[in-house]
């Protein structure tokens, strides 16, 4: 029968007695930077080319037993998970292995850098189809390793890495913390985060998604027909590398940004039990388990968006946090969140010719997060329209006044320390789809975009008094681009997008002694692209 | 990565006569920074990745590496260039004493220096 992990990543329409989705990633080359491998194993024979690259440190101490089959264990298993004949994800993908880990499974940042450079040079000498680089390794945060990954990604290579097995914030490790790399955490057959001894999968905002990583059957280096189960975030990353190979084989022109958005879009949502994660990491950790798309084509019509959280600002009075989108993504909205509720909102601003999302801490606050909504919107022309604080009784308003521009997001930023002491008016922004409304003492920023066939609408859900959280979701066929809160008083902790749902968090009414006049409303801006839909139909 | 002392010796002797000036001093106001792994047991002191500014050419990387060796030799330190990077990042990998970091950070074109560290199978 089909192993649990392959079943988990397979859409129902492919599930038969055997795992055989269309196209096995045959147009894609996957580079594996790991231990040596047993290339004559029946699972991977003829599929993996062992390069002559080797850069490994000496094994520690005298207790080490150099025996080929034992040195090959980790790499052989992963090669099998990516492209193995029987238990592989992308059975048609070809692989090339580089040895950067010794028999102990230990390597160096410098050896990994030289390996990445080798791949780049190979790519320049002999350009082939799409390249996926699998980095099933982790070290401490490394500026240089992250920089090298960024350069390789900008050269069109898709990098996939393990989040790490340290039950810790993945942002403290490299290459897991590199924004350009697809970072994968591990889940088990019960969709629980994987526990490994007393530790387990890493988590946090630097993880892009999770994938099967416990009790994964794959090639064993003990013999050429042996199989073994292994667990770890390496195994999870190997699944995503395989899925990426399948997607790229079906659509070789996909950019890294497009591939990442598709991986997120086709993932199983909200199946992970978040209680396993530390409380302060739950909101930052994506509740996504990787899966293959239900069909290899036809996703192009969708407007894809993802949520990007910034690092924590820190607690100083003027601290700010910045969330950035990838180079070929558009920032369609910006929001902020503070666990203490002490924040001064957020704004979209230009930095290096690109819009970024900046959140502002307030005096006495423990710090803030900026949350960017990053979308794939071809031929988009976006700008930010700002209205300074109105000071008048009806609050501040700003709208998209340019012809053909639609509102994709609203942000508000204020200089006063606590808006809660300045009672806002009761706002009724309904029926004004191209307008942002906010507190009279706040400056309001509207993200206005022009793109072929782009249409957006505002959806709201309000409750009479704060009850922890308010949500509003976009319906099928529409994509959440903006998420904000009204009226933005001090009991609102912030707003953020989770998949297609806008979440507004606030302090519970029982602890704040608020009155019902301080209703909290979650405001979602839902968009779709008729242009992308038409283009897709024309293709079919 | 063999690092026999013989190789060390040979390189240093060959560089003794190298010009040892700081003609191309770092641009005013830009200070190169030093980075190392936050997890002590994973640190590999004695090996450093010297990362040069983005547009630095291979020839400049090689020249900067040679300058470091020459200046180190003048101070009585052995160094070994293990690899010169080009293609992804400009820079070089050097085996040297940590005592030389201050000197290396002042070299022209240097953006930052990172102490090597371990990575592990996951």
């Amino acid at each position: 029968s089909i192993p649990w992990n392959l079943e988990r990543i397979t859409p129902p329409r492919y599930r038969a007695d055997e795992y055989q989705p269309p196209d096995g990633g045959s147009l894609v080359e996957v580079y594996l930077l790991d231990t040596s491998i047993q290339s004559d194993h029946r699972e991977i024979e003829g599929r993996v080319m062992v390069t002559d690259f080797e850069n490994v440190p000496e094994e520690d101490g005298t207790r080490f037993h150099r025996q080929a089959s034992k040195c090959d264990s980790h790499g052989t298993h992963l090669a099998g998970v990516v492209s193995g004949r029987d238990a592989g994800v992308a059975k048609g993908a070809s692989m090339r292995s580089l040895r950067v880990l010794n028999c102990q499974g230990k390597g160096t940042v410098s050896g990994t850098l030289i390996g990445l450079e080798f791949i780049r040079k190979s790519q320049l000498v002999q350009p082939v189809g799409p390249l996926v680089v699998l980095l099933p390794l982790a070290g401490g945060y490394s500026r240089v390793l992250n920089a090298a990954c960024q350069r390789l990604a900008r050269a069109g290579v898709v990098l996939v890495t393990a989040a790490g097995n340290f039950r810790d914030d993945a942002c403290l490790y490299s290459p897991a913390s590199a924004p350009e790399v697809i970072t994968v955490g591990a889940t088990n057959a019960q969709d629980q985060p994987v526990t490994l001894g007393t530790l387990g999968t890493n988590f946090g905002r630097c993880v892009d998604l999770f994938a099967p990583g416990e009790d994964i059957i794959g090639a064993s280096s003990d013999c050429s027909t042996c199989f073994v189960s292994q667990s770890g975030t390496s195994q999870a990353a190997a699944h995503v590398a395989g899925i990426a190979a399948m997607m790229l084989s079906a659509e070789p022109e996909l950019t890294l940004a497009e591939l990442r958005q598709r991986l997120i879009h086709f993932s199983a949502k909200d199946v992970i039990n978040e209680a396993w994660f530390p409380e302060d990491q739950r909101v930052l950790t994506p509740n996504l388990v990787a899966a293959l798309p239900p069909s290899t084509h036809g996703a192009g019509w969708q407007l894809f968006c993802r949520t990007v959280w910034s690092a924590h600002s820190g607690p100083t009075r003027m601290a700010t946090a910045i969330a950035r989108c990838a180079p070929d993504e558009e920032l369609l909205s910006c929001s902020s969140f503070s666990r203490s509720g002490k924040r001064r909102g957020e704004r979209m601003e230009a930095q290096g010719g690109k819009l970024v999302c900046r959140a502002h801490n307030a005096f006495g606050g423990e710090g803030v997060y900026a949350i960017a909504r990053c979308c794939l919107l071809p031929q988009a022309n976006c700008s930010v329209h700002t209205a300074p604080p109105a000071e008048a009784s009806m609050g501040t308003r700003v709208h998209c006044h340019q012809q053909g521009h639609v509102l994709t997001g609203c942000s508000s930023h204020w200089e006063v320390e606590d808006l809660g002491t300045h009672k806002p008016p009761v706002l009724r922004p309904r029926g004004q789809p191209n307008q942002c409304v906010g507190h009279r003492e706040a400056s309001i920023h509207a993200s206005c975009c022009h793109a072929p066939g782009l249409e957006c609408k505002v959806k709201e859900h309000g409750i009479p008094a704060p009850q922890g959280q308010v949500t509003v979701a976009c319906e099928e066929g529409w994509t959440l681009t903006g998420c904000s809160a009204l009226p933005g008083t001090s009991h609102v902790l912030g707003a953020y997008a989770v998949d297609n749902t806008c979440v507004v968090r606030s302090r519970d009414v029982s602890t704040t002694g608020s009155t019902s006049e301080e209703a909290v409303t979650a405001v979602a801006i839902c968009c779709r692209s008729r242009h992308l839909a038409q283009a897709s139909q024309e293709l079919q | 990565q063999e690092d026999e002392d013989g190789d060390y010796e040979e390189l240093v002797l060959a560089l003794r006569s190298e010009e040892d000036g700081l003609a191309e001093a770092p641009e005013h106001g830009t200070t190169a920074t030093f980075h190392r792994c936050a997890k002590d047991p994973w640190r590999l002191p004695g090996t450093y990745v010297v990362v040069l500014k983005e547009e630095t050419h291979l020839s400049q990387s090689e020249r900067t590496a040679r300058r470091l060796q020459a200046q180190a030799a003048r101070r009585g330190y052995l160094t070994k260039i293990l690899h010169v990077f080009h293609g992804l990042l400009p820079g070089f990998l050097v085996k040297m004493s940590g005592d030389l970091l201050e000197l290396a950070l002042k070299l022209p074109h240097v953006d930052y220096i990172e102490e090597d560290s371990s990575v592990f199978a996951q």
């Epitope: 520690d60 207790r63 034992k70 102990q104 499974g105 230990k106 001894g197 007393t198 530790l199 189960s229 | -």
Partner: antibody, heavy 123, light 112 residues
Framework: EVQLVESGGGLVKPGGSLRLSCAAS????????MNWVRQAPGKGLEWVSS????????SHADSVKGRFTISRDNAKNSLYLQMNSLRAEDTAVYFC????????????????WGQGTMVTVSS | ESVLTQPPSVSGAPGQRVTISCTGS?????????VHWYQQLPGTAPKLLIS???NRPSGVPDRFSGSKSGTSASLAITGLQAEDEADYYC???????????FGGGTKLTVLG
């Protein structure tokens, strides 16, 4: 349920040999390092031997080096300790214990232990 | 003699707080390797009590806490209860021995 069950203990004469086994179940055995720890009657815990997940790394305490050999069979989810040239001071309860193999990045705690098997070396 | 040093015994009355120290050297605790603590009740296998210096596995009461500083570590037990009477062992990794090391063990007696 995660479980380790030791077997093979017994009475043996000094100079004799014994082979202990530890059967593992309920977890991905081949991703864990495995250990033997012993406890002489009325005494403390003493680490004896370790073996990494793929057997590439083996370590023994100085007190047993050259006499004891640790091994494993991942296909059978089993750990072994071959004890030769046994001495009276090897008399102890022998426990097998697991720790996740972090490839020397981290040395984890022994989070699961077997119930132990008694080895008595006496003439 | 054990590589890690623990006091042979400690005692305390119910409800009291006791601490058990564990002293190592620059090749084990001082080298940055984590310290783990085990509880062994009479006639049973050891049970993990604290991992990674200060982390409590699920099911371990929050009366137990661990800390580490320099070349030593300590286990603290607050609100002492009769069922805490047991032997306690610290453990770490030693790079010079390429293996694990245990403390000699501390017998905790709950008075009264």
């Amino acid at each position: 349920e995660v479980q380790l069950v030791e077997s093979g203990g017994g009475l043996v004469k000094p100079g004799g040999s014994l082979r202990l086994s530890c059967a593992a179940s309920g977890f991905t055995f081949s991703s864990y390092s495995m250990n033997w720890v012993r406890q002489a009657p009325g005494k403390g815990l003493e680490w004896v031997s370790s073996i990494s997940s793929s057997s590439h790394y083996i370590s023994h305490a100085d007190s047993v080096k050259g006499r004891f050999t640790i091994s494993r069979d991942n296909a059978k989810n089993s750990l072994y300790l071959q004890m030769n040239s046994l001495r009276a001071e090897d008399t102890a309860v022998y426990f097998c214990a697991r720790d996740y193999d972090f490839h020397s990045a981290y040395y984890d705690a022994f989070d699961v232990w077997g119930q132990g098997t008694m080895v008595t070396v006496s003439s | 003699e054990s590589v890690l040093t623990q006091p042979p015994s400690v005692s305390g009355a119910p409800g009291q707080r006791v601490t058990i120290s564990c002293t190592g050297s620059s090749s084990n605790i001082g080298a940055g390797y984590d310290v783990h603590w085990y509880q062994q009740l009479p006639g049973t296998a050891p049970k993990l009590l604290i991992s990674g210096n200060s982390n409590r596995p699920s099911g371990v009461p929050d009366r137990f806490s661990g800390s580490k500083s320099g070349t030593s570590a300590s286990l603290a037990i607050t609100g002492l209860q009769a069922e805490d009477e047991a032997d306690y062992y610290c453990q770490s990794y030693d790079s010079s021995l390429s293996g694990s090391v245990f403390g000699g063990g501390t017998k905790l007696t709950v008075l009264g």
